[in-house]
Every structure is written in structure tokens, then in C-alpha cells.
């Protein structure tokens, strides 16, 4: 995307002792219009079962344009990916809502201690090509142990990271079957430069 | 996750030369300070018993100049709304903290099923002129059985959305009178434009 | 608010029909490249058991330069604080992990009364130095009655709040040793100027 | 199992060109970048580029621009590299290789001759 | 582009001795990466992001350094462990390859 606007250059006094520039330089500062930051807000589908593999969470994927979703100036969404044009540190955030149902967990004992609960975990995943292995950013992690109820509730996630042009970012969670994909109020998805 | 046979991942061709802008390009942009942007940061009040039409959650009223609530940069709050001044991409955000007493509630059947659960629900509206309806862009919903206790716990909900001139956000409660307004940091409401 | 750094003009090229200043027209404002605004994410370290006043929650430390944390552009981190250097509107946020074990809560009462539940609590609190009281910004606070088991869960809180130079934000909890340390994605605190 | 299986050796002309093919199995090629890399008989490593499969953007060496095109096909989980106007400095094995997701995997390696 | 210059080009080396190899970059990376390739075999990721064996990667190597200057040792050698290391760096485009330390026997 092109900008319609205006070449900035920025122009000040430096205080004295400042570190990057002599006084009275003029200096050029990466100044930009905050409408033309990469940004994306993507929200729930209903998920197709995928296979994946054995300890790794299976990846969400999302709408990107209907509703309230959309990505823009560069912020490209694909194959579950969110895809970052722009090096830069960026505000990224996540809601699943999951909903299931559990039997009464307190009565199944393991040798008299407590059991291992059943839980819900959601990780908002980095993939990139300066690092081997993904990195998880966040992760939101919840043991459910409802009383044999229907049981519903929501995780949500959000925090700043520096991120590199060509950083790929990803939903997964622990278990695909438990999303609520039924609002894009509920699930959903975003990052933007700051 | 392994794909389908035959499902491909979009795959697209980057202009020759790249993908974003050439370099040297002379940019126009509509720059403005930050510090003028519309920002409000709005906190909890008691609130005044309400009839409210059925099916349908009643508002939340707050507070906007006290202690740490404010409104700024021709962002207004009148009777439960925010006012959008200006179109563009704001954060907009909410945590309401519940409090209350839940009876055992696994021991309460239908025909043998598990119960439907009490549930404690929050969503953020936007409210256009130019539209019949309101728009849910935000909802956290979390079913309650706390086995015979006193409970309490919060919903936090953000996200990022482009709103135009003139909308109107609001906080929508499943239950006004479990809202704990005691303190103004447990229960708020905010946007800023990005 | 005062500027650190220098006053910034930016001349540009209004649109026609701009609404907010005529063609050519030369205007002052305070423009800033985004990438200079202090910043800071910091992630969970184990925390040494330091003794608190009571009625006074521990506050927690940070990493603020190892894996995913970072503070940049003049926010610093010293002794369980992120200094503020500038004044401004902030983001401020946190997501603290628990675990623990709880008996079986609803088992326990007094004179027939639900017992009070066992909790959870996280503040971001800001301390000015010009102010004697530190300042509660926001709270996450949960009743656990977990049915006997190995439970665990987040509190995730964020808000903006309009900060002034000088002053010091902390995380504080109810319960330093139910507080996940081990992993950076799980427990976190981070703050960047708008 | 995870692993890249490359196409078979390659004899061609200078002038000529070649496309090397390197087909993924265990993962999803959407999932990782796809690198090439290029060594020379007797000779060290040479990154030649990669591609992001999921968007279909590449990132060269500058001196492999020109002449060499990297590509995916994601329904056959195969990614290409395609070098152009051979010349005999071109003779050499090159790999496939993925990062973005461990374990790092490399293909076997492809030999390319050029001679006349 | 960030050069990466390896050192010593050869290191001679007995079985049951330590072995240290370098490599110095042009500019500062965040991680360094070792491969370890053997005559006819494609190169096997060896260290990653400075100091991460790979999996099947002995505890006898070791990887350590930052900013430019970056080291992998050997605590001691093992007949196997005769090959050729090369270190890449991932922090600058292009990526980039040292030439490689040949570690011989003795």
C-alpha cells in the first residue's frame, strides 16, 4: 500500500549531554502515520480435525475479513498464520473461549492423592526463520475440574514482543474439540505495531 | 499439523522488487501527535437497579473523572456510553469482577443430565446509528459452580477494532447485581485510538 | 506533558476537505518515531521469599533482559520495579499464573455459614514518590475451591493509565509460593507509552 | 517420519537449467521455512535463500537473486529450487533444509554438473 | 552481509583430549548454529542458538559465546566426533555460513 500523505522529517533542539544527536541537527526520525501500521483482528471459524503431531497443540484457524475480522497495510493472514511485515514491537492478544463437559474429577484418586486434573491451554506460538524452534510468547493455562457439569469459560491472552519481518504467529491449543466457534465475540485473534 | 491431501496454503506472488514499498519511496502520511488522541479509561460505580428489556444484558453506568477514570482528546462518556469522536482502530478493553453464592450445583438434575450451570456473562457493544442493531464485539462467558461458597473472580476482555465517528461503546452484564463496584480497580472500561 | 527530547514540527500537505488544518499550512505538534517510546515486557523468575508487612502483598520480580524480556528506550527495571522515565498515557499489563492445592472447601464451614473460599489476587500497583499511599491500578482477584485437587489458573490484567515521570509500578500477589515460575510465556509484566 | 527426500542427480549443459525438487513428509511444509543451500566439491556451505511457503515470500543472497527462483507447492508438501543460465561454478550439491521447527532436517543433497 | 571466520582451519586432535574450535562474526548475532558434516553426508545440525545440543548430540560438546565471538568444544574427543564444523548465523540477511574448522586426528 501505497501512503497518500506527506514526506515528515522532524526538526529539533537536542538537550544538551543527548546521546544520538548534536544540538541544532536537523534530524530524520521513522516517523509514520499510525493508519498504515500492519494490523490484524482474525475471529473463530469452525475448525476442520486436523492430524498433528504427538505433544504438539494443534493450530486454530480464523476468519480474516468477514465480520468483525480483518488485516491490514501488510498484515497478512494465512494457513492459520498471521504473518508480520514489519520488524517491530508489536501488541499481540488471543481469547478462546472452550466449553465441555467433565465428570466429578475430586472422586478419581491415584493412590490416595489428589488426580491430575483435566485442563485448558491456549499459546499464542512464533515461528521464525532466525530460531529453529517455535517460540511460545504466551501461554494461558487452566486445570478444569467442574463437578460433572457443562462447564464454559474463556482464556485470555495478551502482551508486547519484538518481532522480525517475516515472523509467522499462530493459535494452539490443547484440545481443538473444546473451542467455542460459535461468536466471533468469543474466539478470536490480533496483533498490531505499536 | 499435516494438511489434507491436495489442500494447499494461499500462496502468492510478491511483486518484483518486494513486497512492500521501494526503498527511497517519498511518503505521504497524515501524522498526529500522540498525545491528542481520543483515550478514556472508565471505572466502576455502584449501580442503580435498572429494568432492562428480557433477553437482553443491562448496561453498566461509570464513573469518568474521579481517581483514576478519565476521558480525553473529545472522547466523551454520557449515560453508559462511550462516544467515538473520531474513525480509526481503537484498543478497546473491560474487566468486570463478579461476586457471589452458588448452591451445589452438580447435585441439581434434569432427568439425569448435568445441570445447566449459572453463568456470569460480559460483553462490550457498539451501538452505530446506522445500523438497527448492536454489534457484539466482545464477550466473555464463563459458567459458575462453586460448590456452595462465597465466590468471586473477574472476565477480561480486549481486542482491537475499527470504529467510526459517532459509535458508541458499552459493558453489558449478564447480572447487574453480582458486579462487585467496590473498587475501581477490580471492575473498568477503556479505548484508545491506535 | 513535557518533552525529553525536543520539540517536533511536521510540515505537510493537508487533503483537501482536511478538517483540521488548511492547505500548506505549517503545524507544530509533538511527533515522535514510535520505536523511542519506553517499553518494557518482563518475565517470572523464581522468587526468593522476602519478608512483607502484613496486609501487605509481596511484590514480585522480574527477568527484564533474558529470552523474551526486554526494556528499552530509558523504562527501566531495578529492585521489583519498572521505572517510569516520561510522562504519558501507558498500557500497563500482567498475567500471573497459580498453582496450588486446595481441600475440598465446601466441606468446611462455620456455624452453618459457606466458608470464605480460599483466593487468588494480583495488583499492578504504581508508587509516586510525591504521594505517600501506593496506588492500587488494578486488580485480579478469584476465589479457589478447587474439589481436592491440583489446581491451576491465570489472572491476566490490562488498562491505560496516565503515569507521570518518575513513577514505579509493581506486581504484587496474595501468595508469592502458589505464583508459576517456570516458564517466561506463563507469568509476565509488561508497560509501553501510547 | 520427518524428513526432505531431494530429486536425483542432475548432468546439464551451460546455458541450460534445473530445478531441484526436495518433498517434505512428517510435517506441514506450512508450518517451517524452506532454506537451500549450495556446497561446492572440496568447498564450505553457501545459503542460497528461503521461502515461507505459507505466503510464498523468499528472502536471496544477493548474489543468488538473479539466477536462482525458490517455490513451493504446498498441496505435494514440495518445495523447488530453479537455478537458471548454468555456468560450470553452479556444479556443486545443494540441499533443502527446513527451520522454524525442531528438529532442523536437511534433504540428502541433489548434484548438479554442468558441463559441456 | 555478516562474515564469520572460523578458527583454527584444522585442529589436530588425540581421542580422550579437549577440543576448541571458534568462530569470530564481522558485526554482533544473537544465536551462533553448529553443523557437523562428515565426507559424502549432508550436514547434521549439531548446536543451536549457542548453546542447545540437537537431539543425539553427545553432552561431551558444548556451545557458548555471544555478541561475536562464539565457541563449540569438545570435552573429549571421541574417534566419531572426526569431521568438519561449520557455524551460521541466522541474526542477518543473507544467512550466513563460516568456512569451517576441519577437526582431524592426531
Known amino acids: 500500500q501505497l501512503r497518500a500523505q506527506g514526506e515528515a522529517c522532524v526538526q529539533f533542539q537536542a538537550l544538551k549531554g543527548q546521546e544520538f544527536a548534536p544540538s541544532h541537527q536537523q534530524v530524520y526520525a521513522p516517523l509514520r502515520a499510525d493508519g498504515d501500521k500492519p494490523r490484524a483482528h482474525l475471529t473463530v471459524v469452525r475448525q476442520t480435525p486436523t492430524q498433528h503431531f504427538k505433544n504438539q497443540f494443534p493450530a486454530l484457524h480464523w476468519e480474516h475479513e468477514l465480520g468483525l475480522a480483518f488485516t491490514k497495510n501488510r498484515m497478512n493472514y494465512t494457513n492459520k498464520f498471521l504473518l508480520i511485515p514489519e520488524s517491530g514491537d508489536y501488541f499481540i492478544y488471543s481469547q478462546v473461549t472452550f466449553r465441555g463437559m467433565t465428570s466429578e474429577c475430586s472422586e478419581i484418586r491415584q493412590a490416595g492423592r489428589p488426580n491430575k486434573p483435566d485442563s485448558i491451554t491456549v499459546v499464542i506460538t512464533k515461528v521464525t526463520d532466525s530460531y529453529p524452534e517455535p517460540t511460545q510468547l504466551l501461554m494461558g493455562t487452566k486445570s478444569v475440574c467442574e463437578v460433572g457439569s457443562n462447564w464454559f469459560q474463556p482464556i485470555y491472552l495478551g502482551a508486547m514482543f519484538s518481532l522480525q519481518e517475516g515472523d509467522k504467529l499462530m493459535v494452539n491449543v490443547s484440545d481443538i474439540s473444546l473451542v467455542d466457534y460459535t461468536k466471533e465475540d468469543k474466539t478470536f485473534f490480533g496483533a498490531f505495531l505499536l | 499439523q499435516l494438511r489434507a491431501q491436495g489442500e494447499a496454503c494461499v500462496q502468492f506472488q510478491a511483486l518484483k522488487g518486494q513486497e512492500f514499498a521501494p526503498s527511497h519511496q517519498q511518503v505521504y502520511a497524515p501524522l498526529r501527535a500522540d498525545g491528542d488522541k481520543p483515550r478514556a479509561h472508565l471505572t466502576v460505580v455502584r449501580q442503580t437497579p435498572t429494568q432492562h428489556f428480557k433477553n437482553q444484558f443491562p448496561a453498566l453506568h461509570w464513573e469518568h473523572e474521579l481517581g483514576l477514570a478519565f476521558t480525553k482528546n473529545r472522547m466523551n462518556y454520557t449515560n453508559k456510553f462511550l462516544l467515538i469522536p473520531e474513525s480509526g482502530d481503537y484498543f478497546i478493553y473491560s474487566q468486570v469482577t463478579f461476586r457471589g453464592m452458588t448452591s451445589e450445583c452438580s447435585e441439581i438434575r434434569q432427568a439425569g443430565r448435568p445441570n445447566k450451570p449459572d453463568s456470569i456473562t460480559v460483553v462490550i457493544t457498539k451501538v452505530t446509528d446506522s445500523y438497527p442493531e448492536p454489534t457484539q464485539l466482545l464477550m466473555g462467558t464463563k459458567s459458575v459452580c462453586e460448590v456452595g461458597s462465597n465466590w468471586f473472580q473477574p472476565i477480561y476482555l480486549g481486542a482491537m477494532f475499527s470504529l467510526q465517528e459517532g459509535d458508541k461503546l458499552m459493558v453489558n452484564v449478564s447480572d447487574i447485581s453480582l458486579v462487585d463496584y467496590t473498587k475501581e480497580d477490580k471492575t473498568f472500561f477503556g479505548a484508545f485510538l491506535l | 506533558q513535557l518533552r525529553a527530547q525536543g520539540e517536533a514540527c511536521v510540515q505537510f500537505q493537508a487533503l483537501k476537505g482536511q478538517e483540521f488544518a488548511p492547505s500548506h499550512q505549517q503545524v507544530y505538534a509533538p511527533l515522535r518515531a514510535d520505536g523511542d517510546k519506553p517499553r518494557a515486557h518482563l518475565t517470572v523468575v523464581r522468587q526468593t521469599p522476602t519478608q512483607h508487612f502484613k496486609n501487605q502483598f509481596p511484590a514480585l520480580h522480574w527477568e527484564h533482559e533474558l529470552g523474551l524480556a526486554f526494556t528499552k528506550n530509558r523504562m527501566n527495571y531495578t529492585n521489583k520495579f519498572l521505572l517510569i522515565p516520561e510522562s504519558g498515557d501507558y498500557f500497563i499489563y500482567s498475567q500471573v499464573t497459580f498453582r496450588g492445592m486446595t481441600s475440598e472447601c465446601s466441606e468446611i464451614r462455620q456455624a452453618g455459614r459457606p466458608n470464605k473460599p480460599d483466593s487468588i489476587t494480583v495488583v499492578i500497583t504504581k508508587v509516586t514518590d510525591s504521594y505517600p499511599e501506593p496506588t492500587q491500578l488494578l486488580m485480579g482477584t478469584k476465589s479457589v475451591c478447587e474439589v481436592g485437587s491440583n489446581w491451576f489458573q491465570p489472572i491476566y490484567l490490562g488498562a491505560m493509565f496516565s503515569l507521570q515521570e518518575g513513577d514505579k509500578l509493581m506486581v504484587n500477589v496474595s501468595d508469592i509460593s502458589l505464583v508459576d515460575y517456570t516458564k517466561e510465556d506463563k507469568t509476565f509484566f509488561g508497560a509501553f507509552l501510547l | 517420519q520427518v524428513q526432505l527426500v531431494q530429486s536425483g542427480a542432475e548432468v546439464k549443459k551451460p546455458g541450460a537449467s534445473v530445478k531441484v525438487s526436495c518433498k517434505a513428509s512428517g510435517f506441514d511444509i506450512c508450518d517451517t521455512y524452506m532454506h537451500w543451500v549450495k556446497q561446492r566439491p572440496g568447498q564450505g556451505l553457501e545459503w542460497i535463500g528461503r521461502i515461507d511457503p505459507a505466503s510464498g515470500h523468499t528472502k536471496y543472497d544477493p548474489k543468488f537473486q538473479v539466477r536462482a527462483t525458490i517455490t513451493t507447492d504446498t498441496s505435494t508438501s514440495t518445495a523447488y529450487l530453479e537455478l537458471s543460465s548454468l555456468r560450470s561454478e553452479d556444479t556443486a550439491v545443494y540441499y533443502c533444509?527446513?527451520?522454524?521447527?525442531?528438529?532442523?532436517?536437511w534433504g540428502q543433497g541433489t548434484t548438479v554438473t554442468v558441463s559441456s | 552481509e555478516i562474515v564469520l571466520t572460523q578458527s583454527p582451519g584444522t585442529l589436530s586432535a588425540s581421542p580422550g583430549e579437549r577440543a576448541t574450535m571458534s568462530c569470530r562474526a564481522s558485526s554482533s548475532v544473537s544465536y551462533m548454529y553448529w553443523y557437523q558434516q562428515k565426507p559424502g553426508q549432508a550436514p547434521r545440525p549439531w548446536i543451536y542458538a549457542t548453546s542447545n545440543l540437537a537431539s543425539g548430540v553427545p553432552d561431551r560438546f558444548s556451545g557458548s559465546g555471544s555478541g561475536t565471538d562464539y565457541t563449540l568444544t569438545i570435552s573429549r574427543v571421541e574417534p566419531e566426533d572426526f569431521a568438519v564444523y561449520y557455524c551460521?548465523?541466522?541474526?542477518?540477511?543473507?544467512?550466513?555460513f563460516g568456512g569451517g574448522t576441519k577437526l582431524e586426528i592426531k
Open positions: 533444509a527446513r527451520s522454524g521447527g525442531l528438529p532442523d532436517v
Open positions: 551460521q548465523q541466522w541474526s542477518g540477511n543473507p544467512r550466513t
